[in-house]
């Protein structure tokens, strides 16, 4: 949602968190701002304090309940407002009618671990975190491997078009240090986006067997 010169973007993690970023050109300095959430069909409402992440943007997390509680559904609409204090009053800076399951961004996958490693291949598994049971198997993943002398941006993306919480990396170089990351995205939602990348998992392939004399 855009008001004046501001931009207000929020995502639902599918369980009990709405994360918001508000950016504004020539924004007010030393001003207290909050995001207020008012669902249309729930008894609760929630507020979080916007904290600066750069000179002209602020972020906060609306914690709706315990991490794995299912606080919203696809039929909910949540009115989200950015309110800033001016004098003793609050002034509305931005507003949007937020459809949580149209604006999904899951938590980064967790618990990455090497299941099996060889000279040229490595089997890695992970878990999804705080993802709604509503998705059933309707998730996809992207993975990337960091090779020596390269950057993450140069790493080719591997796509897993199903809910598959493991991957077998092939054609690796023996006795080489690699890093691996994965991210997840539900298939649902017009404005749904990829989760953040997972914490990198470092692993080393096994050295090639020494030739016999």
């Amino acid at each position: 949602a855009v008001n004046g010169t501001s931009r207000f973007t929020c995502f639902y993690n599918s369980r009990a968190n709405i994360s918001c970023v508000w950016s504004q050109d020539g924004a007010l300095q030393d001003t207290s701002c909050q995001v207020h959430a008012w669902p249309d069909r729930r008894r609760w409402n929630q507020t979080c304090e916007l904290l600066p992440v750069s000179q002209a943007s602020w972020a906060c997390n609306l914690i709706l309940g315990t991490p794995d509680s299912q606080k919203l559904t696809a039929v909910d609409i949540v009115t989200l407002r950015v309110m800033c204090r001016e004098g003793v009053r609050w002034r509305m800076m931005a507003i949007q009618d937020f459809k949580p399951f149209e604006n999904l961004r899951l938590m980064a996958p967790i618990s990455l671990q090497v299941v099996h490693v060889e000279t040229h291949r490595c089997n890695i598994s992970w878990k999804i975190s705080q993802a709604s049971h509503y998705f059933e198997r309707h998730l996809e993943f992207e993975a990337r491997t960091l090779s020596p002398g390269h950057t993450w941006e140069e790493a080719p993306l591997m796509t897993l078009k199903q809910k598959q919480e493991w991957i077998c990396l092939e054609t690796l170089t023996p006795d080489t240090q690699y890093e691996f990351q994965v991210r997840v995205k539900p298939l649902q939602g017009e404005f749904t986006t990829w989760s953040p990348w997972s914490q990198p998992l470092a692993f080393r392939t096994k050295p090639a067997a020494l030739g016999k004399d």
């Epitope: 008001n3 004046g4 501001s6 309110m83 001016e86 003793v88 009053r89 609050w90």
Partner: antibody, heavy 121, light 112 residues
């Protein structure tokens, strides 16, 4: 019916203080802001600042900072404005006015009848 | 502080005729949320001010439709389409976009 009833006229000596009260009725006192505006004789209107009775938070116009104090007593739905170190230029009618806690549309919708403060030696 | 300048200072009008009051701000009063918090208050003789118009052109409840507001940026106008006897008084513009909020000096409307 929303009403703001202010205390009566005051005559003060230079250097003294005056405390004007504003009793609210017809609405929930702690849901709205009380602004104070003054009007010197034959002059225009001047916004002095305001108080939110819900938490007692105040904001004062820089022009009056250090001399003005706004308070409230929620038990009797009354707001107060005290102005100290009075000088002749403070001779004016002082108004309280109600405003929404969220400034969505307008600053002040209902006004008190005004309190005349005369500063004279 | 934003200075609000009103013209004319005094406006003699004939009953039933239109009247127009101008208000100019020393800087743009579009708030950073995109709204313009320009209000008009009427003060009849011996009475407290009364809200007429808010956010440039919206009439407050109970305000007759002969009152209208217009303008943008720094230039604003209050119009009375047909002046009635009860419209006599002083009219103030007010900006609520930039704290401290400020009033114009007032325009006195009187019957010729």
């Amino acid at each position: 019916e929303v009403q703001l009833v202010q205390s009566g006229a005051e005559v003060k000596k230079p250097g003294a203080s005056v405390k004007v009260s504003c009793k609210a009725s017809g609405y929930t006192f702690t849901d709205y802001v009380i602004s104070w505006v003054r009007q010197a004789t034959g002059q225009g209107l001047e916004w002095m600042g305001e108080i939110y009775p819900g938490d007692g938070n105040t904001y004062y116009n820089e022009m009056f900072k250090g001399r003005v104090t706004m308070t409230r007593d929620t038990s009797i739905s009354t707001a107060y404005m005290e102005l100290s170190s009075l000088r002749s230029e403070d001779t004016a009618v002082y108004y309280c006015a109600r405003g929404s806690y969220t400034y969505d549309n307008y600053a002040m919708d209902f006004w008190g009848q005004g309190t005349t403060v005369t500063v004279s030696s | 502080d934003v200075v609000m300048t009103q013209t004319p200072l005094s406006l003699p009008v004939t009953l039933g005729q239109p009247a127009s009051i101008s208000c100019r701000s020393s800087q743009n009063i579009v708030h950073s949320n995109g709204n313009t918090y320009l209000e008009w208050y009427q003060q009849r003789p011996g009475q407290s001010p009364r809200l007429l118009i808010y956010k440039v052109s919206n009439r407050f409840s109970g305000v007759p439709d002969r009152f209208s507001g217009s303008g943008s940026g720094t230039d604003f106008t209050l119009k009375i389409s047909r002046v009635e006897a009860e419209d006599v008084g002083v009219y103030y513009c007010f900006q609520g976009s930039h704290i401290p909020w400020t009033f114009g000096g007032g325009t006195k409307v009187e019957i010729k």
